[in-house]
């Protein structure tokens, strides 16, 4: 006999879940591996997902689904620091499933919903990782937690413009379809479809930002949390031309003959998934740190324009956002190729390695651009100091790829709350759902921005000390893992985790991290709104809440203002100079030819053929 608490009728059919224990001798109910799309197999590879068709039997949703096909990091096969991010389930193209954790309250009703989107550079990630276990957050904050798998790498982001067979961005469309599933079904699980916060980290946060920008995604959720990622910035999107170049290169690498788009896609579909994964890194045009092969593409559909242009014009969802960064966003990426860096030593960096590393970190910059970066990040009284060179590299990679794009995103969002506040009243703690339109066309803006800097290094971290507070290592605190005694966190870390879960859930419920479930506000520890002028943000660590102003403003002025302009101006100079040299060469050849002809003519004794 089936337990009614564990069996739920959804729009598509019945699903059976399971009870999972949580630390205080209680439990949550989990539905793991619910299908939300038809398996994207065969002809469906590279194509947008199709909604799952109904089923008749009870669907067994008691265990995590397969992970989507992806590159696996085998750099250190015996090291949990890398292994924790690798898929812990078999990989398959049949991977479009989602998970739901429901607090074990009697008949949960209209609970706030938090939907997690994993990161992994758009080339990796899976919803089944231990660090994304939704049970602790669901139980502690009485919210419904959802996470989904989405296609990554070429399977999710291979794009050939003009082709319905591989339009690109299908991994984002997988996420959107899961959000639609939540709208259609979450009330069966006691969740409120009008109170859905999407949250993610790194490429997952970039995805969250993309749904804030993408007009067709905006109505499918209420609010957004972005952890160490935004949709703008150097690695998150490519042009259609670049996406096409990479698709063609992948075809060549796996032995597909040159031909038209249809032939190429048919050939790529005939290959084993692992064949595509094995070649994916080789399609990059240059080797750089924090660069990934198959990422979202500016397609004119999912993205009407570039994220930068949409941000600048206020073309984004009018709602509240909470976002932030970790103290050492760059360190993780340095050990994957920057000269002199290793997790297995102190990574004391020579000046020569530093200069080489800067080149790898900003691969699109010309000489003068690199010089600007070096100038900004060098202590010229101590330029050979190996510790300072190491820390500068950490800052360069982190600021360029995470911190400064996020600061820009926050400022653009906050700026529109001011602009709209002048034509209406900005509502900072609004409990409503926000409109699904743009910030720029709403006289009564609901935009408010909350920003954090996470700067606590976990006591049980397996990575070396010099790597600091690493990219991705706030996630375990957001998901409440420190509540699990066997994981060896300190009591202070458990308290920090409880605080962070409360902030995140308060924000999801009300749009304000300070407003508790009962409506009270802890006046001693108030997290202020981030504005584009003051840029107030909080430090999240085991100390009491501290408010800071300006998030790396000096450094972000380089990345967000000066460097783009410098490259724009000097790139034009370089182009003009190249063009001038080519023209001059042609002109010289012509003049030489003319001179020879004239010399020949002048040597003639008399004019002929007159």
């Amino acid at each position: 006999q089936t337990d009614p608490e564990l069996t739920i009728m959804t729009r598509l059919g019945q699903v059976q879940g399971t009870r999972l224990p949580v630390p205080d001798r209680s439990h949550v109910i989990a539905f793991l591996g619910i299908p939300f799309a038809e398996p994207p197999l065969g002809k469906m590879r590279f194509k947008p997902p199709e909604p799952k068709k109904p089923w008749n039997d009870v669907f067994d949703a008691r265990d995590y689904p397969s992970a989507c096909y992806q590159y696996v990091d085998t750099s250190y096969p015996g090291f949990s620091g890398t292994e924790m991010w690798n898929p812990n389930r078999m990989m398959s193209e049949d991977c479009l499933y989602l998970n739901v954790w429901v607090p074990a309250t009697p008949r949960p009703h209209n609970l706030t919903v938090m939907v997690w989107i994993y990161g992994g550079g758009f080339y990796s990630g899976s919803s089944s990782l231990d660090v994304y276990d939704g049970r602790y957050l669901a139980h502690s904050e009485k919210v419904v937690v959802v996470s989904m798998n989405y296609r990554v790498s070429a399977f999710g982001f291979l794009a050939l413009n003009g082709s319905a067979e591989a339009p690109g961005n299908v991994g984002l469309l997988d996420q959107r379809l899961a959000l639609q599933w939540v709208q259609d079904n979450i009330h069966f699980f006691g969740g409120n479809p009008k109170q859905v916060t999407i949250f993610g980290e790194s490429a997952g946060a970039a995805s969250v930002g993309m749904h804030l920008l993408s007009p067709d995604s905006r109505p499918k959720f209420t609010r957004a949390i972005l952890q160490s990622g935004v949709p703008n910035g150097p690695w998150r999107t490519v042009s259609f031309d670049e996406a096409r170049r990479r698709a063609i290169k992948l075809g060549r690498l796996v032995g597909c003959p040159d031909g038209n788009d249809t032939d190429l896609i048919d050939c790529l579909r005939s290959k084993q998934p692992q064949d595509l994964i094995d070649q994916e890194w080789l399609v990059l045009p240059f080797s750089g740190l924090f660069r990934f092969s198959f990422v979202p593409v500016i397609d004119g559909v999912v993205f009407p324009d570039t994220p930068e242009a949409m941000l600048n014009s206020g073309n984004f969802k009018d709602t509240q956002i909470l976002l932030g960064v970790n103290q050492n966003e760059g360190s993780y990426f340095l050990i994957y190729g920057a000269p002199g860096f290793s997790k297995d030593n102190e990574s004391l960096i020579t000046r020569e390695d530093f200069l080489q590393g800067v080149k790898m970190s900003v691969p699109h910059a010309n000489e003068i651009g690199l010089e600007a970066v070096i100038l900004q990040y060098t202590d010229w009284m101590d330029e050979d100091n190996p510790i300072k060179n190491r820390e500068a590299m950490d800052d360069i990679v982190g600021d360029h790829n995470v911190v400064c794009p996020l600061q820009h995103f926050a400022k653009m969002y906050a700026q529109y709350s001011i602009l709209q506040g002048q034509t209406g009243t900005a509502s900072q703690g609004n409990l409503g759902w926000g409109n699904s339109g743009s910030a720029s066309n709403s006289g009564n803006s609901q935009v408010s921005v909350y920003l954090y800097m996470f700067d606590h290094r976990a006591s049980n971290l397996v990575w070396p000390e010099w790597m600091g507070v690493i990219h991705g290592y706030e996630i375990e605190f957001v998901f409440g893992l420190p509540l699990e005694k066997r994981l060896n966190y300190t009591l202070e870390e458990e308290k920090l985790s409880r605080r962070m879960m409360k902030y995140w859930a308060n924000f999801a419920r009300t749009g304000n991290p300070n407003i508790n479930v009962d409506g009270s506000i802890d006046s001693r520890r108030r997290w202020p709104v981030f504005t584009s002028t003051e840029q107030k943000h909080v430090g999240l660590n085991t100390d009491s809440l501290k408010v800071h102003k300006g998030l790396k403003s000096q450094f972000c002025a380089l990345w967000n203002r000066f460097l783009p302009r410098l490259l724009n101006v000097t790139e034009n100079i370089d182009d003009a100079e190249r063009q001038w040299k080519a023209e001059f060469h042609r002109w010289s050849s012509y003049m030489m030819h003319w001179k020879n002809q004239f010399d020949h003519y002048s040597k003639q004794e008399r004019c002929t053929n007159l």
């Epitope: 085998t74 250190y76 096969p77 015996g78 090291f79 094995d278």
Partner: antibody, heavy 125, light 106 residues
Framework: EVQLVESGGGLVQPKGSLKLSCAAS????????MHWVRQAPGKGLEWVAR??????????HYADSVKDRFTISRDDSQTMLYLQMNNLKTEDTAMYYC????????????????WGQGTSVTVSS | QIVLTQSPAIMSASPGEKVTMTCSAS?????MYWYHQKPGSSPKPWIY???NLASGVPARFSGSGSGTSYSLSVSSVEAEDAATYYC?????????FGGGTKLEIK
């Protein structure tokens, strides 16, 4: 059946060179990381070098004791693994094993799951 | 580099006895691997990832441990278990082996 067969060992003078080969069969060679491990007479095991697969850009790692003297390489089309040993020293005298690293999809992931019979290298004047 | 120290270097046991050998790491590692080698033969994988027995390894063997301290145990030793056992870590480069524990059967 997985097979690893080493060859190329022998007697060589100090400062001399030698190239070891390992013929692999019975598995999809190009998807596996491969290693050389050595064992001096009557002593324990010492890891020498690792080469990863093409999807990992054939990245290599070496033990400090052989760095800048030994070079590990592979030829996926011939399913061959090589170890080029230059500037040999007497302390390089050992049995050299060609070893496969278990792949992510195997239960043996991360372990040295198949070993050849070894080829003996003696460095002596 | 991480140094692995195995103890004892040599141990002797009678058939049916329980034996335990240890492997101590100079800094914390996530997993330990164990190999078994008989004289004149190549090493064979014995225990994967701290506690998973390789195929064909008798159930009387077990592995355990965490952090810097790991062990391999045999619940009831048999004559065929005489061999040298090596621990190995792959937590960081360079990969390292312990010096080995030689198990002799009386």
């Amino acid at each position: 059946e997985v097979q690893l067969v080493e060859s190329g060992g022998g007697l060589v003078q100090p400062k001399g060179s030698l190239k070891l080969s390992c013929a692999a069969s019975g598995f999809t060679f190009n998807t596996y990381a491969m290693h050389w491990v050595r064992q001096a007479p009557g002593k324990g095991l010492e890891w020498v070098a690792r080469i990863r697969s093409k999807s990992n850009k054939y990245a290599t790692h070496y033990a400090d004791s052989v760095k800048d003297r030994f070079t590990i390489s592979r030829d996926d089309s011939q399913t061959m693994l090589y170890l080029q040993m230059n500037n040999l020293k007497t302390e390089d005298t050992a049995m050299y094993y060609c070893v496969r690293e278990g792949s992510y999809y195997d239960s043996s992931y991360g372990a040295m799951d198949y070993w050849g019979q070894g080829t003996s290298v003696t460095v002596s004047s | 580099q991480i140094v692995l120290t195995q103890s004892p270097a040599i141990m002797s046991a009678s058939p049916g006895e329980k034996v335990t050998m240890t492997c101590s790491a100079s800094s914390s590692v996530s997993y330990m691997y164990w190999y078994h080698q008989k004289p004149g033969s190549s090493p064979k994988p014995w225990i994967y990832r701290t506690s998973n027995l390789a195929s064909g390894v008798p159930a009387r063997f077990s592995g355990s441990g965490s952090g810097t301290s790991y062990s391999l145990s045999v619940s009831s030793v048999e004559a065929e278990d005489a061999a040298t056992y090596y621990c190995q870590q792959y937590n960081s480069h360079p990969m390292t082996f312990g010096g080995g524990t030689k198990l002799e059967i009386k």
